[in-house]
């Protein structure tokens, strides 16, 4: 009887410890639904324009924005300012990067542009002095962008 009471108490202790650890971890990573709300709220256009400027340069094919109207460094600053409105967590940053990828998927014309876009995108947190997500799957749109 005493043995089973000790067992139950130990199990309860483990469960409480696990739950608080999970809460701490969630706090560190950023709550998923809260990140989604934050990503929806910020304007990611400057980030999209900044990256397109970097990979397209002065290329005439990309005319969906007038990308020549603003210097790339200005766009980068505006992008960082927008990202600064979000929690600086790996999860939130990853969701923002995924959203940028999804927004631009249709504008990327070939596999090379997709690779370049992903590379520039993964450099974005560093450029803005934010925490870079260690694992962030940018294969959005059914894994095909």
């Amino acid at each position: 009887m005493a043995k089973s009471t000790i067992l139950v108490a130990l199990l309860a202790l483990v469960l409480v410890a696990h739950a608080s650890a999970m809460r701490r971890e969630r706090g560190r990573q950023g709550d998923s639904s809260s990140c989604e709300r934050q990503v929806d709220r910020v304007n990611l256009k400057p980030c999209e324009q900044h990256i397109m400027q970097r990979i397209m340069g002065e290329q005439e094919q990309y005319d969906s924005y007038d990308i020549r109207s603003t210097r790339s460094s200005d766009q980068q600053q505006r992008c960082c300012d927008e990202l600064n409105e979000m929690e600086n967590t790996q999860r939130c940053m990853c969701e923002a990067l995924q959203q940028i990828m999804e927004n631009q998927c249709d504008r990327l014309q070939d596999r090379q542009m997709v690779q370049q876009f992903k590379r520039e995108l993964m450099n974005l947190p560093q450029q803005c002095n934010f925490r870079a997500p260690q694992r962030c799957d940018l294969d959005v749109s059914g894994g095909r962008c």
């Epitope: 290329q59 094919q61 014309q109 596999r111 090379q112």
Partner: antibody, heavy 115, light 107 residues
Amino acid sequence: QVQLVQSESELKKPGASVKISCKASGYDLTKYAMNWVRQAPGQGLEWMGWINTNTAKPTYAQGFTGRFVFSLDTSVRTIYLEISNLKAEDTAIYYCSRDGSGASWGQGTLVTVSS
Amino acid sequence: DIQMTQSPSTLSASVGDRVTITCRASQNIGRWLAWHQQKPGKAPKVLITKASNLESGVPSRFTGSGSGTDFTLTITSLQPDDFATYYCQQYTTYSGTFGQGTRVEIK
């Protein structure tokens, strides 16, 4: 406009090597992916792989590793396909093609492998 | 590897007919699909990229549609110049397989 001009036909003996070129004009070579495609006599199109013209990194399709090498020389706006240890079954027309908007094909290079 | 299945293999049609060729991918490829036209003894020519983008100089009677795994090429009113073989091609980041081709011949 976008133009891809390939080297002339080649007649080679089994075991030899061949290097085919594809010269791009009318756009910035380093902006778009370039593919190599094989078409054996009377057959369909077979994708061999692609080269990232920005990083020069090649990606080979299954069945095209080992004897096949993609390379590029941006100074002369040209990509290359080299096939070593040629076999009779390598006899085909080889095409270069460019991805993206304004995608285009070279006119093809016939490689005949015969003893 | 991603497989592309085209149908039909051969299609007999008359000038003025509406022609539809379908292409199915073995897995989701988003919109990374191109359609090519090839005439005997000639290099292929690109008709459509990104599933529905008509390439410059291609007549508007050619239309592409679809996304994910199912794609269609439609020629609204077949012209004498359209009798050829048509290939679909997926061009995702790590592969670029073609369908086996559809030969459009005169009925």
